[in-house]
Every structure is written in structure tokens, then in C-alpha cells.
Amino acid sequence: GITIPRNPGCPNSEDKNFPRTVMVNLNIHNRNTNTNPKRSSDYYNRSTSPWNLHRNEDPERYPSVIWEAQCRHLGCINADGNVDYHMNSVPIQQEILVLRREPPHCPNSFRLEKILVSVGCTCVTPIVHHVQ
Amino acid sequence: GITIPRNPGCPNSEDKNFPRTVMVNLNIHNRNTNTNPKRSSDYYNRSTSPWNLHRNEDPERYPSVIWEAQCRHLGCINADGNVDYHMNSVPIQQEILVLRREPPHCPNSFRLEKILVSVGCTCVTPIVHHVQ
């Protein structure tokens, strides 16, 4: 059978739980400096479905700061600058990977976790349910 | 600064690069048990700034498939269903973490990487630059 060539530069794992517990290099490749979404664009203010950004901070998680969007209105902003309730502001959500310290407070031991975050809001036509 | 209390049950790290290289349990914990992000919506079709989802695939990355939003129009859909070019459809971007094997083919060594993805689109009022 084909075996994966063992790279001599691979760290050796003595862990009995292998392959579930592995070494992860946190020296992030492609480190984008702008992590605060307010700095990257002002869409959250200019959108017809504007949102506020809330700082979600957790020292037991990496990244420790995640920005969560909350739509400002149920409706959307119309051309007159008023809220139109015939349309809906809704959050766009995405599942992301984070690392959580496990056991808690361990500086160098984590678990991979998937969490759902709201990234921004968009304006949608509502689904109308007709009464039979 | 705040120091994390040392938990006696923590795995010990002899790594000189600590805290850049950490132990991670890869048995993914999913916190989204009640809200499945895939099921969440057909907002991409119902939005006034609709978008298409394009597959970004990389077999050496986890997740291997990431969906990228591309706004369908430069403008936004108005109440008549037409594109209004006085408004702009713009992508909402987010930085996410992915895992990459490093060195390649090492079964127990990974590197965290940040990538920027477009999650969806929102409709914004354009910035008008007045000519002096």
C-alpha cells in the first residue's frame, strides 16, 4: 500500500491520543494587520441594513477578540433615511474555527472549535406566509 | 500584565518557540448545535444586494472548501426588481483561521493561517467625491 513519506523534519508525537492531539504553529502565516472591521470599511454605517459591532472577548479563546455584528433595525433604511419595515435587516453568519484553551488556563494546550459569528447585515425581501 | 494561572494538569511544553507552538486537540467541538449555518438562509437570493457563492477549494487546507461570495451587481435591487446604480452592492469580508499541514504530509504538525473571505453582500450608499 502507499504510505505517506515520513518527512524527517516532522515533529515526533509521543502522545497516546495521536493523531487527535497535534502541534500547531501559531506564528500565523498571512497575518493581516487590520483585525478591527471598523477600520477596514465603514460599510456598517453606510449600509441600508446598518449594524453595530460588538467586541466579544474571551481570554480562553484564540483569537481572544472577535467582532460580532448586530443589525440596528428590523427594517432597512430607505432613500429618505427612514426605516422601511416592508424589508428586513438580517445578519449574515459564518462558521469559523477558533482555538479554546483546554484544560482552561493552560497556556499551551488548546482544542479546535467551530463557532458561528455574525459578520454584517444585509437587506432582504421578507418571506410572506399566506393564510389559507 | 495578566498571567494565566498555571494549571497543574496542563501538558508541559519544552518547545523553545513557546507559546508559538502549542498542543491542539483536533477533535472539533461544534458549538453550533442549534443553529446550522448552512441551513440558515437563502439571503443570497433575497437580498437587495444578492450574491453568488463560488467554491474555493484547497485539499491541503482545512476546511478544504470555503465559499466565496461575489456580488451579482454593481448596484442594488430596488422595489421594482431593477438594478439601481445610485446604490452599491459591496462584499462583507471577514478574516478566518484555517489549518495547513506544515511541513507538508506531517501527520501531527500544522500551521494556523489567516485568510480573508467574502461572506455575503450588503447595499451601501456610495461615497460621492465632489470635484473642486
Epitope: L112 | K38, R39, L53, P59, R101
Partner: antibody, heavy 117, light 106 residues
Framework: QVQLVQSGAEVKKPGSSVKVSCKAS????????ISWVRQAPGQGLEWMGS????????NYAQKFQGRVTITADESTSTAYMELSSLRSEDTAVYYC??????????WGQGTLVTVSS | DIQMTQSPSSLSASVGDRVTITCRAS??????LNWYQQKPGKAPKLLIY???SLQSGVPSRFSGSGSGTDFTLTISSLQPEDFAVYYC????????FGQGTKVEIK
């Protein structure tokens, strides 16, 4: 080109277990999951569960919880599906498939498991 | 579990015909719907993913549409090699398949 090659047909007695293998050739498992899907004679397709070989993370369909075990050996690029407490209604073709967590894009050729006393 | 209901369960058509198969989900699944083709004694083959995206190598006569709960697979001009069973599958939640649609020669 990814190819998934499965082990041969099996005949088993009710109450016993079967272990089917699925070997990825022409490449490693990469970061995809491997899912197992079965098809009883003349019937439709039924998802049983999956594993992400990179991580060892498994996910099982509720119907098979406790009776199916999916494992993977990265050194040989092989995934395994073991089904225990076999009954006649488990007679089916068992497929492994590469799973992006959105669709199944490469399938094994299938393994017929016959449960008969 | 999300139930997937295909219709019709079988259809007879001639080479060159336009064929439409529908699939309905028991709840909204956004666009997380795939279509597969299966020939006798063979494994299924992915045709369409994410409701409307054509898998590479699949002829352009196959197309998919729909969103939410109602989806359609269309074969614009049926070819002799298209006679097979077609399955829809959702991946909004743990995967489930439709019961299949058999496309037979008229």
C-alpha cells in the same frame, strides 16, 4: 486523480461484525472527510457517518449510532467502517466517498455485504 | 432529519427530449443541494453541487436550479448515456438523499 479502492465482498452471519476498508490512491486523504453511504438492493442511498482523517473527528447518523465505528489510518491512506450486530436488513452495497462537507465528489466502487444465516 | 422527496419516481423519455426532475426538502436548505447520477452496478457520480454549480467534467446539458425547499435538475437534450437513476441530496444538515428518479428509454 483521487481514487478510492474498497475491499472485497463479504458474507456474514447475523449478530457478527463486518469491517470494510477504503484506500485512497493517487494522493493522500488531504483535508477532506471520508463518508460511508450504503445502498440496500433496489433501494436508495443512506448516509451512515464520516471521519476527517487529519483530525480523527467522527460524525455518525443517529440511526447507526452505537453500531458503526469509522476509523482512519493516515499512514496507509485507508479509512475503515465497522458495522456490528449485523442483521439481514444490513445486506447492502457499502460505499466510501470523499466528502468536502458539502458534497461527495469521489466514490469507491462499493463493497457488497451479505448478511445471511 | 431533513426529508427529500423526488418526483417523478420514474419517467420514460426519448433521446433529444428535455427532462426535468424535481426535489423538495421538508425544510429550507438554502442552496445546499446536490444531484447525482447512478448507473446499474456503479457508484453514484456528482453532477451538480450547491443547487446550480456544474461539477467539472459533467456535460453542460445538465443544469440545476432552485433555493430553499424546491429544486430542479434539467437535462436539456437527453443522450443515450443519460439513462440512469438520479438522486438529489441535501447537505444542509447530516446528509439525506431523495428516493431516486429512474430515467428510462421510451
Amino acid at each position: 486523480q483521487v481514487q478510492l479502492v474498497q475491499s472485497g465482498a463479504e458474507v456474514k452471519k447475523p449478530g457478527s461484525s463486518v469491517k470494510v476498508s477504503c484506500k485512497a490512491s493517487g494522493g493522500t486523504f488531504s483535508s477532506y472527510a471520508i463518508s460511508w453511504v450504503r445502498q440496500a438492493p433496489g433501494q436508495g442511498l443512506e448516509w451512515m457517518g464520516s471521519i476527517i482523517p487529519w483530525f480523527g473527528t467522527t460524525n455518525y447518523a443517529q440511526k447507526f449510532q452505537g453500531r458503526v465505528t469509522i476509523t482512519a489510518d493516515e499512514s496507509t491512506s485507508t479509512a475503515y467502517m465497522e458495522l456490528s450486530s449485523l442483521r439481514s436488513e444490513d445486506t447492502a452495497v457499502y460505499y466510501c466517498a470523499r466528502d468536502s462537507e458539502y458534497y461527495f465528489d469521489h466514490w469507491g466502487q462499493g463493497t457488497l455485504v451479505t448478511v445471511s444465516s | 432529519d431533513i426529508q427529500m422527496t423526488q418526483s417523478p419516481s420514474s419517467l420514460s423519455a426519448s433521446v433529444g427530449d428535455r427532462v426535468t426532475i424535481t426535489c423538495r426538502a421538508s425544510q429550507g436548505i438554502s442552496n445546499w443541494l446536490n444531484w447525482y447520477q447512478q448507473k446499474p452496478g456503479k457508484a453514484p457520480k456528482l453532477l451538480i453541487y450547491a443547487a446550480s454549480s456544474l461539477q467539472s467534467g459533467v456535460p453542460s446539458r445538465f443544469s440545476g436550479s432552485g433555493s430553499g425547499t424546491d429544486f430542479t435538475l434539467t437535462i436539456s437534450s437527453l443522450q443515450p448515456e443519460d439513462f440512469a437513476v438520479y438522486y438529489c441530496q441535501q447537505y444542509s444538515d447530516d446528509p439525506t438523499f431523495g428516493q431516486g428518479t429512474k430515467v428510462e428509454i421510451k
